[in-house]
């Protein structure tokens, strides 16, 4: 039938092209100061000089020239706290999401030369300075080493490290991805006397093995200890080393709380409170009970003691503990009391002040919105972000609570700064919040500014993306709306990206972009020029993103609705939204598609297989197809265990494969990278097998040697070009 293409007319501005997106033509910049004191910071300039800035004296100078950086091909740096040395990082080699190895060189700023003798081994898995002076801790071949000074020989702290078996000071795969969200698992005490670290023992974990084809005659096999749902998990132990005697005395193990140690458990985070006080957080394998344990160094025993009366239990009765992760405490100056975000009695995540017991916690914020992150606690102020302002869950503003006052007074620092341009902020504070940088991500062009921590006065614009603003002047950008729709007693926020010169009386094809994972959020007031922006701008497609049940920052009732039944409400709510969009009158109901990546690939697959007839076609990139195939920490957090006496039935019912027959009446494009360490290719292989067995036609594309991000330049270009062709064909749009 004739194509109904929307063509913008009578405008000198041009539409976005796919090439614009693939070339990153319209990418924005942010500016995060690398704070080195209350009023000083470093920043890497456009031409790769490392520049020192003093806010108060207004002085700035190059502390490390780009020629020194180039001499070792450095791409990153780190200044020692005594300002005598800089480490230069080069030969960056990515491993998993956060982890990478690199070569490190130490540059002596006093002498203006590289430190020779006892050079660091290569490649190093992690390296960091002590918080005071210039001690170095690093991880090499899964063991931790310590240098008292950069030119000194190293002391080996751990000896148990073994590839794919025992990891010291760095997480294994599952902890990196699903628990810590870091490449490191070691933490210096504030005075640099102690070094805490985690040992992960993966000896009993099953291995995921996949082929990496490379260029050789034979592919090589990648082996990763990867616990899938219900499998054996890593065994974790936390140790603390006294760096005064790293050679003489072995690391001291920190005891695990009894109520945690009685069954399978996780370590979730470590926070130094003071030079001889540390706070550890633990989580039961069934992730609805978290224990925060405060431990003290006992000089007389030379050991760490964690008294029972310093254990604080956080429990969820409606779902899992915490949001995506259990929140971490922000300790006050007294090193005893702390502020922490957890659910209040109404199920909204808010800041609480804990002095002795969780039962006696004082609620600091309240309302039908959520506190999201505590940035800094000082003597008289607490800075945090929330989505309170004007009731939009997808906004982020920064607030200050004056805790010196009684009762504490609250001020929104960002709400009225650049109200139209900026509704989604993060912040970066100097040590005691004397100054801070605000980074606004949208909805307008991102802008980074510097502020006085006492008056909140703007001191300077650090980055305002002027070049981007100029280059967008002649581009027809789509219009972005963030609104809510109601269905029964539920409210769903959505973002709609409308083609330029959108006309409500016309009919447009609709593409739903979905993620939908527990505690995620897609409807955010942020700036973006990406593939879907192009689809709206050039191809006249309406794009919608909907935050259904299970998504974050709207209370536990909404969040925990999906607990133990993934794949039900997330899909249902996308379908509900599509029906509501059709009712709006400008959607061509014959041309509706859905696409998603990762969890979004799972939801889009289930939506296509819902049997509703709403979708003509859809794309799943790197989808999960069964929660039994995914990582234990993630799957079990939301689904429990895949055992008969727990939740095996829903594990089986919620697979994509179980719906194979229902793909018969949709056009399905299935895409996966063969070297996906996260959502294994196995997931798509099983979908494909089920579709073949059901004799259902579908399209597929694999990306050889690509991981979960399919991010290599060539692959990404191919991927988006391929998906564009598929969509245009589905929507009968001419090339």
């Amino acid at each position: 039938r004739p194509s109904r293409v929307y063509k913008p007319e009578g405008n000198t501005k041009r539409a976005l092209t796919l090439k614009d997106i693939l070339n990153g033509t319209f990418s924005y910049k942010t500016y995060f100061p690398n704070w080195i004191s209350e009023q000083e910071y470093l920043h890497q300039s456009e031409d790769d000089n490392i520049v020192f800035y003093n806010i108060e004296t207004r002085e700035s100078y190059i502390i490390l020239s780009n020629s020194t950086m180039k001499s070792v091909n450095a791409t990153d740096y780190g200044l020692s706290p005594d300002r005598q040395f800089v480490y230069l990082e080069s030969d960056y080699s990515k491993l998993w999401r956060y982890s990478y190895t690199a070569t490190y060189y130490i540059y002596d700023l006093q002498n203006g030369e590289f430190v020779r003798g006892y050079e660091l081994p290569r490649p190093i898995q992690y390296l960091c300075w002590s918080p005071v002076g210039s001690k170095l801790a690093y991880v090499y071949q899964n063991n931790i080493y310590l240098k008292q000074r950069p030119g000194d020989p190293p002391f080996q702290i751990t000896y148990t490290g073994r590839e794919n078996r025992i990891f010291n000071g760095i997480p294994d795969w599952v902890y990196e991805e699903e628990m810590l969200a870091t490449k490191y698992a070691l933490w210096w005490s504030p005075d640099g006397k102690f070094l805490a670290y985690v040992e992960f023992n993966d000896s009993d974990i099953p291995i995921i093995a996949y082929s990496y084809y490379g260029d050789g005659q034979y592919p090589r096999t990648i082996n990763i200890p990867y616990p899938k749902a219900g499998a054996k998990n890593p065994v974790v132990r936390v140790f603390i080393v006294d760096t005064t005697y790293p050679h003489h005395v072995g690391p001291m193990e920190v005891p695990v709380p009894e109520m945690i140690a009685s069954s399978d458990y996780y370590f979730s985070w470590l926070t130094w409170v003071s030079s001889e006080r540390v706070c550890l957080q633990w989580l039961k394998r069934v992730q609805n009970v978290s224990v925060l344990s405060i431990c003290d160094f006992r000089e007389d025993w030379h050991a760490w003691e964690c008294p029972k009366n310093q254990e604080h239990v956080e429990e969820s009765r409606t779902g899992w503990a915490g949001g995506f992760f259990v929140s971490t405490p922000a300790f006050s100056q007294d090193a005893t009391s702390y502020y922490k975000i957890f659910s209040d009695k109404d199920g909204y995540k808010h800041i609480h002040y804990i002095k002795d017991t969780v039962e006696n916690a004082i609620q600091i914020t309240s309302g039908k919105w959520e506190a999201i992150y505590i940035f800094r606690v000082t003597q008289d102020s607490l800075f945090y972000s929330s989505n309170e302002f004007e009731g939009y869950p997808g906004r982020r503003n920064i607030y200050r609570i004056s805790i010196g006052n009684s009762p504490p007074s609250k001020k929104c620092v960002t709400c009225h700064l650049r109200k139209e341009r900026c509704q989604y902020y993060t912040a970066s504070f100097s040590y005691k919040a004397k100054y801070y940088a605000l980074v606004c991500y949208g909805p307008g062009l991102p802008i980074s500014t510097l502020h006085d921590g006492r008056t909140d006065q703007e001191i300077q614009v650090l980055e305002e993306n002027k070049e981007l603003e100029n280059s967008l002047r002649n581009i027809q950008l789509p219009k972005v709306e963030i609104k809510k729709l109601k269905d029964g007693g539920l409210t769903f926020w959505y973002k709609m990206i409308l083609p330029p010169q959108f006309d409500r009386s016309k009919k447009y094809p609709l593409l739903i972009q979905v993620y939908g994972g527990p505690c995620s959020q897609s409807v955010k007031s942020v700036f973006a020029v990406n593939w879907i922006t192009y689809l709206a701008s050039k191809e006249g497609i309406v794009i919608a993103l909907v935050d259904g049940r299970g998504t974050a920052f709207q209370g536990d009732k909404f969040l925990h609705a999906v607990y133990r039944k993934l794949g039900v409400y997330e899909v249902e709510d996308q379908l509900t939204a599509v029906r509501k969009f059709i009712e709006m009158g400008f959607i061509d109901e014959e041309r509706i598609a859905i696409w998603g990546w990762s969890y979004g690939g799972y939801v889009s697959s289930l939506a296509l297989a819902s049997g509703t007839g709403l979708f003509k076609c859809g794309i799943a990139v790197a989808p999960v197809s069964s929660w039994e195939y995914y990582a234990s920490i993630y799957s079990e957090r939301f689904m429990g265990l895949p055992t008969k006496d727990d939740n095996l039935e829903h594990y089986k019912n919620s697979t994509v494969m179980a719906r194979a027959e229902y793909f018969r009446n949709v056009d399905y494009l299935l895409i996966h990278g063969t070297a996906d360490d996260n959502v294994h290719f196995q997931n798509s292989a099983q979908i494909a097998k089920a579709l073949v067995n059901a004799q259902v036609d579908f399209q597929a594309m694999w990306y050889s040697d690509q991981n979960h991000g399919i991010s290599s330049g060539r692959s990404q270009n191919h991927l988006y070009t391929h998906m564009t062709h598929f969509l245009k064909q589905c929507f009968s749009l001419s090339d």
Epitope: Y118, P153, P154, Q156, D242, H247, H248, G250, M252, H302
Partner: antibody
Framework: QLQLQESGPGLVKPSETLSLTCTVS??????????WGWIRQPPGKGLEWIGS???????NYNPSLKSRVTISVDTSKNQFSLKLRSVTAADTAVYYC????????????WGQGTTVTVSS | EIVLTQSPATLSLSPGERATLSCRAS??????LAWYQQKPGQAPRLLIY???NRATGIPARFSGSGSGTDFTLTISSLEPEDFAVYYC?????????FGQGTKVEIK
């Protein structure tokens, strides 16, 4: 093969300073993975760790002896030394010098020991 | 400081017999425990490091086990040259300390 040899006077008067030297042969005292230490054993008794030194000169002492002990190193001579001030009869012991490979590998090379008697 | 208590003080056995020596710590020392052998008029010799690893050149009849507070040195079949005093040493706590020793004598 690494060897250690203690030397010094076998008799020291009370309140004086005991001085011993350990000579390292068959290897360098500047090895980055070793500390060099002193252990003593009073007659018919157990072993007591006195202290140790790194080739760079950094030292660690047993708190019970810290106020009286000094350990020093001379890398050019491949030697390290022990000084114990204000000795009493309770300091009479066999003194051993050792190579200390650290908390994990232990004290793997010992000198044969030298007897020091504190008596007037 | 950590106190290491060795038992028994004396063990009287015949060649070929199995010797089991115990070392108990006043608090956990993890696995940071070494065993030394000392013969009359000689310096001690390192036998076992990190609770269970044999030092270079030590015969397989010597084995170490345990972690936390309870450790054992086992000599599976006593040879004549094994009759000596055995010391355990902890490296978990500052300062490193030794046990008082167990004497293994010929019965």
């Amino acid at each position: 093969q690494l060897q250690l040899q203690e030397s010094g006077p076998g008799l020291v008067k009370p309140s004086e300073t005991l001085s011993l030297t350990c000579t390292v042969s068959g290897g360098s005292i500047s090895s980055s993975s070793s500390y060099w230490g002193w252990i003593r054993q009073p007659p018919g008794k157990g072993l007591e760790w006195i202290g140790s030194i790194y080739y760079s000169g950094s030292t660690n002492y047993n708190p019970s002896l810290k106020s009286r002990v000094t350990i020093s190193v001379d890398t050019s001579k491949n030697q390290f030394s022990l000084k114990l001030r204000s000795v009493t009869a309770a300091d009479t012991a066999v003194y051993y010098c050792v190579r200390d490979k650290g908390y994990y590998y232990g004290m793997d090379v010992w000198g044969q020991g030298t007897t020091v008697t504190v008596s007037s | 400081e950590i106190v290491l208590t060795q038992s028994p003080a004396t063990l009287s056995l015949s060649p070929g017999e199995r010797a089991t020596l115990s070392c108990r710590a006043s608090q956990s020392v993890s696995s940071y425990l070494a065993w030394y052998q000392q013969k009359p008029g000689q310096a001690p010799r390192l036998l076992i490091y990190d609770a269970s690893n044999r030092a270079t050149g030590i015969p397989a009849r010597f084995s170490g086990s345990g972690s936390g507070t309870d450790f054992t040195l086992t000599i599976s079949s006593l040879e004549p040259e094994d009759f000596a005093v055995y010391y355990c040493q902890q490296r978990s706590n500052w300062p490193p300390t030794f046990g008082q020793g167990t004497k293994v004598e010929i019965k």
